[in-house]
């Protein structure tokens, strides 16, 4: 894991339990799904459903699996080589600038605007001006028309792991 690691990502203290599989490092690195021993001689497997590693590494521990928050659905579980993939529930979305929570999609566009994009797990409905066709930033909507939208079906899963 060459990326910056924050301490919140880390798994609880691990000592190599007898059931954890061991293998030898290759050029000082252990394969995905493993971490290295203190002396650098062994690769110790991560614990399925508890922690993981995605890259060849020389870390002393595997990374803690993400737990999906309430308001999220689990698209795929945590394995020893891949973190949990969580996605916002239908009718909610997660913005890049506020990734910590799922927000409710707007039910309709402000007056004078028309909906051109559905609510997806990673974006709010998209509105454009009827005349100019320019996008609406989607901040605080003005008085809403009765144009409403049903939550859109995601085109593809949005992985927010790592």
């Amino acid at each position: 894991e060459s990326a910056l690691i924050t301490q919140q990502d880390l798994a609880p203290q691990q000592r190599a339990a007898p059931q954890q599989k061991r293998s030898s490092p290759s050029e000082g690195l252990c394969p995905p799904g493993h971490h290295i021993s203190e002396d650098g001689r062994d690769c110790i497997s991560c614990k399925y459903g508890q922690d993981y590693s995605t890259h060849w590494n020389d870390l002393l521990f595997c990374l803690r699996c993400t737990r999906c928050d309430s308001g999220e659905v689990e698209l795929s579980p945590c394995t020893t080589t891949r973190n949990t993939v969580c996605q916002c529930e239908e009718g909610t979305f997660r913005e890049e600038d506020s990734p910590e929570m799922c927000r409710k999609c707007r039910t309709g566009c402000p007056r004078g605007m028309v909906k051109v994009g559905d609510c997806t797990p990673w974006s709010d409905i998209e509105c454009v001006h009827k005349e100019s066709g320019t996008k609406h930033s989607g901040e605080v909507p003005a008085v809403e028309e009765t144009v409403t939208s049903s939550p859109g079906t995601p085109a593809s899963p949005c992985s927010l792991s790592g």
């Epitope: 000592r15 290295i36 870390l59 002393l60």
Partner: nanobody, 121 residues
Framework: EVQLLESGGGEVQPGGSLRLSCAAS????????MGWFRQAPGKEREFVSA????????FYAESVKGRFTISRDNAKNTVYLQMSSLRAEDTAVYYC????????????????WGQGTLVTV
């Protein structure tokens, strides 16, 4: 925020002893190593010794084996370097550092560093 505070440096006669301490705070990693490095004037920083928190695995540079002893106090989150039979070539600024990598004897494997303490023999 991880902080490392070294102490115990000073001036000593050849053949004498010193004990360096490094107190760590802000560490919540499940396991980590604490190492000592040294840097003499005009020279590169070099590895001296390291100890790991969970299993207590230790490493020493060949130049200090048999003279220096590294130990740890888990309750105090402190690592010690007992230096004996000191020589003129041991004169350097001694740095404490923390790693989350195994078998870490290279500077680039260490993520956090203290300010250093001067040892003059």
């Amino acid at each position: 925020e991880v902080q490392l505070l070294e102490s115990g440096g000073g001036e000593v006669q050849p053949g004498g002893s010193l004990r360096l301490s490094c107190a760590a705070s802000g560490l919540t990693f499940p396991n980590y190593g604490m190492g000592w490095f040294r840097q003499a004037p005009g020279k590169e920083r070099e590895f001296v010794s390291a100890i790991y928190w969970s299993g207590g695995t230790v490493f020493y540079a060949e130049s200090v084996k048999g003279r220096f002893t590294i130990s740890r106090d888990n309750a105090k989150n402190t690592v010690y370097l007992q230096m004996s039979s000191l020589r003129a070539e041991d004169t350097a600024v001694y740095y404490c550092a923390v790693t989350i990598r195994g078998a870490a004897t290279q500077t680039w494997k260490y993520d956090y560093w203290g300010q250093g303490t001067l040892v003059t023999v």
